[in-house]
């Protein structure tokens, strides 16, 4: 077999070839959140397990202080699921001038922080009204998409109400990213 | 064009290069489930279409007896959507001492079975309370994430109630995995 | 370092190697939908932002007239999230002969159009009953899976009711695809 048989043509390749097993990747899983100070006017960020059980980081993708650190520029697929659970009273009870009240809601945001840029960028948002009829409820919000990230970017997952996150099992609430 | 222009440096490559088109991949689609014996204390597993319509398996990724067989070790993205449909009575009707009753729920679990390990591992779980007000209801649960798998691992999709799964269309309920 | 150390063996490689950064990719984000003529008996298609903000197309993946154009054959991961919002009256009020009424619903379909084939193919569908109790509601539907596509195929996202789509933020409603 001649090596040339699979040599890429000039048309095909515009970047160095690289082994897939060497790409930055992470899958983080839920841990219990302890009460902390939140930034004003910003949803609180979740912190994560990064090495026990199903969780891992590899190939220079590091997790530190609620953030995934992007080690090289490129297109990444980023995903998260957060399972929420809580209890709501019947949300159609309280009406003002015959109008239905503003429903309770649950929201997940995957946020990018770039040190050179003053404001975080919201990459993905999943938001749901919760209007269960006087009952314990639980439900997941799943997000996933591809983004062009730069070396040094940081990713985090923010939620509307940290006390409603189901932290009991690593398969219910998770966060991951991998270089394509 | 010199072949070396795209030769990876020692720093870049820690595994053999391989063509993307050669990677194990599968997308399975729903079929009508026939009644079968379920294991005690375990949600029943779905079986799948693996070659007709949108469904396929390729590059040594095989489907057999409700399982996707992992042909080589590596990091895989695994996903599934299950659409459920059913009918619930108003779940706040039945109360004991004025308290809301435990809601009905629907659950999907993507499970890994390793022959050398006695217990299956739950990789992903999506679970939702269903508390619709006296109505036919339908809704999907979607899951997807990346996991490090070993050659010989087997993947299946388990559901809380097989009789509620919408098996009518291949685009509503599906299961897939691909090597990254 | 000898180039041969990472030369793929005959067993490993059945297709030309190619750089990942050169693969067709797109992430499209929501824009306000203008009223248009819809095809009879077909859900209306959304149109998208393809270059501003988080949106991009690259490596010959083009967006035109509501469609993503597939520039080369291969296996693609395709995804979309659509966030809906609306207001429903209590949907258990209207009954016929004691039976619950047909609930309102929201549906997203990712559709493939192949010029040589008369009918579009539905690749992915997410559909949910909406039966909120007299309240403003909002919720996302997320879809994602892998499909074998041919050069020249076109992808679009159809929704059951274009007027319920939340077009306010690029992180809430989006559509993307990338060659694996």
């Amino acid at each position: 077999l001649k090596g040339q048989e699979f040599a890429p043509s000039h048309q095909q390749v515009y970047a160095p070839l690289r082994a897939d097993g060497d790409k930055p990747r992470a899958h983080l899983t839920v841990v219990r959140q302890t009460p902390t100070q939140h930034f004003k006017n910003q949803f609180p960020a979740l912190h994560w397990e990064h090495e026990l059980g199903l969780a891992f980081t590899k190939n220079r993708m590091n997790y530190t202080n609620k953030f995934l650190l992007i080690p090289e520029s490129g297109d990444y697929f980023i995903y998260s699921q957060v399972t929420f659970r809580g209890m709501t009273s019947e949300c159609s009870e309280i009406r003002q001038a015959g109008r239905p009240n503003k429903p309770d809601s649950i929201t997940v945001v995957i946020t990018k922080v770039t040190d050179s840029y003053p404001e975080p960028t919201q990459l993905l948002m999943g938001t749901k009204s919760v209007c269960e009829v006087g009952s314990n409820w639980f439900q997941p919000i799943y997000l996933g998409a591809m983004f062009s990230l730069q070396e040094g970017d940081k990713l985090m997952v923010n939620v509307s109400d940290i006390s409603l996150v189901d932290y009991t099992k690593e398969d219910k609430t998770f966060f991951g990213a991998f270089l394509l | 064009l010199k072949g070396q222009e795209f030769a990876p440096s020692h720093q870049q490559v820690y595994a053999p290069l391989r063509a993307d088109g050669d990677k194990p991949r599968a997308h399975l689609t729903v079929v009508r489930q026939t009644p079968t014996q379920h294991f005690k204390n375990q949600f029943p597993a779905l079986h799948w279409e693996h070659e007709l319509g949108l469904a396929f398996t390729k590059n040594r990724m095989n489907y057999t007896n409700k399982f996707l067989l992992i042909p080589e070790s590596g990091d895989y993205f695994i996903y599934s959507q299950v659409t459920f449909r059913g009918m619930t009575s108003e779940c706040s009707e039945i109360r004991q001492a004025g308290r809301p009753n435990k809601p009905d729920s629907i659950t999907v679990v993507i499970t890994k079975v390793t022959d050398s390990y006695p217990e299956p591992t739950q990789l992903l779980m999506g679970t939702k309370s269903v508390c619709e007000v006296g109505s036919n209801w339908f809704q999907p649960i979607y899951l997807g994430a990346m996991f490090s798998l070993q050659e010989g691992d087997k993947l299946m999709v388990n559901v809380s109630d097989i009789s509620l799964v919408d098996y009518t269309k291949e685009d509503k309920t599906f299961f897939g995995a691909f090597l990254l | 370092l000898k180039g041969q150390e990472f030369a793929p063996s005959h067993q490993q490689v059945y297709a030309p190697l190619r750089a990942d950064g050169d693969k067709p990719r797109a992430h499209l984000t929501v824009v306000r939908q203008t009223p248009t003529q819809h095809f009879k008996n077909q859900f209306p298609a959304l149109h998208w932002e393809h270059e501003l903000g988080l949106a991009f197309t690259k490596n010959r993946m083009n967006y035109t007239n509501k469609f993503l154009l597939i520039p080369e054959s291969g296996d693609y991961f395709i995804y979309s999230q659509v966030t809906f919002r609306g207001m429903t009256s209590e949907c258990s009020e209207i009954r016929q002969a004691g039976r619950p009424n047909k609930p309102d619903s929201i549906t997203v379909v990712i559709t493939k159009v192949t010029d040589s084939y008369p009918e579009p193919t539905q690749l992915l569908m997410g559909t949910k009953s909406v039966c909120e109790v007299g309240s403003n509601w909002f919720q996302p539907i997320y879809l994602g899976a892998m499909f074998s596509l041919q050069e020249g195929d076109k992808l679009m996202v159809n929704v059951s009711d274009i007027s319920l789509v939340d077009y306010t933020k690029e992180d809430k409603t989006f559509f993307g695809a990338f060659l694996l």
């Epitope: 219990r32 302890t34 100070q37 659970r85 109400d161 | - | -």
Partner: antibody, heavy 118, light 107 residues
Framework: EVQLVQSGAEVKKPGASVKVSCKAS????????MHWVRQAPGQGLEWMGW????????NYAQKFQGRVTMTRDTSISTAYMELSRLRSDDTAVYYC???????????WGQGTMVTVSS | DIQMTQSPSSLSASVGDRVTITCRAS??????LNWYQQKPGKAPKFLIY???RLQSGVPSRFSGSGSGTDFTLTISSLQPEDFATYHC?????????FGPGTKLEIK
Amino acid sequence: EVQLVQSGAEVKKPGASVKVSCKASGYTFTGYYMHWVRQAPGQGLEWMGWINPKSGGTNYAQKFQGRVTMTRDTSISTAYMELSRLRSDDTAVYYCAVGGSYDAFDIWGQGTMVTVSS
Amino acid sequence: DIQMTQSPSSLSASVGDRVTITCRASQSISSYLNWYQQKPGKAPKFLIYGASRLQSGVPSRFSGSGSGTDFTLTISSLQPEDFATYHCQQGSSPPFTFGPGTKLEIK
């Protein structure tokens, strides 16, 4: 450091009311549910209810419904529990507790002894 | 309400012993089971959540297991500071209820 500091011991007559305060520090007060749990001498722990400091919404155990009122003052990060129509079997240590999730109690106050005696 | 029972109500053991305390719920509570340690005159201390997950800072000699209705707390090798009362608590649905407690005493 997360801390909950409760008001001091109280002695009350049967039929009276008591109001116990719980001042929170070291975390975002409105971000986490505040619970009240009591423990009668030599007995187990008994959950009384919660308040969501952000919304003011409450959930009381059936046993205390109609007798307990939980309130909060977000400006001073303080939660209050008032128990009315006191009986001798209300003699107990009353704890406030906060959790990272609404269903468990990570951090506890030091407790407030309430004695109901004629 | 969901009733929680614990056994034994008290037990005597020595430093270095392995001890197991069981907790049972009157209906399934999935994995929503928490364990607390309480010493005389003190507030309870959070030990284990989600039936088996150790709260940060809790020594690894403590472990929990179970799901559904039956749960156990195990201390693999008793230390002098472990002699206390242990409470289980269900977090599945309000009203949150505690077991009556298990008093662990020095033999």
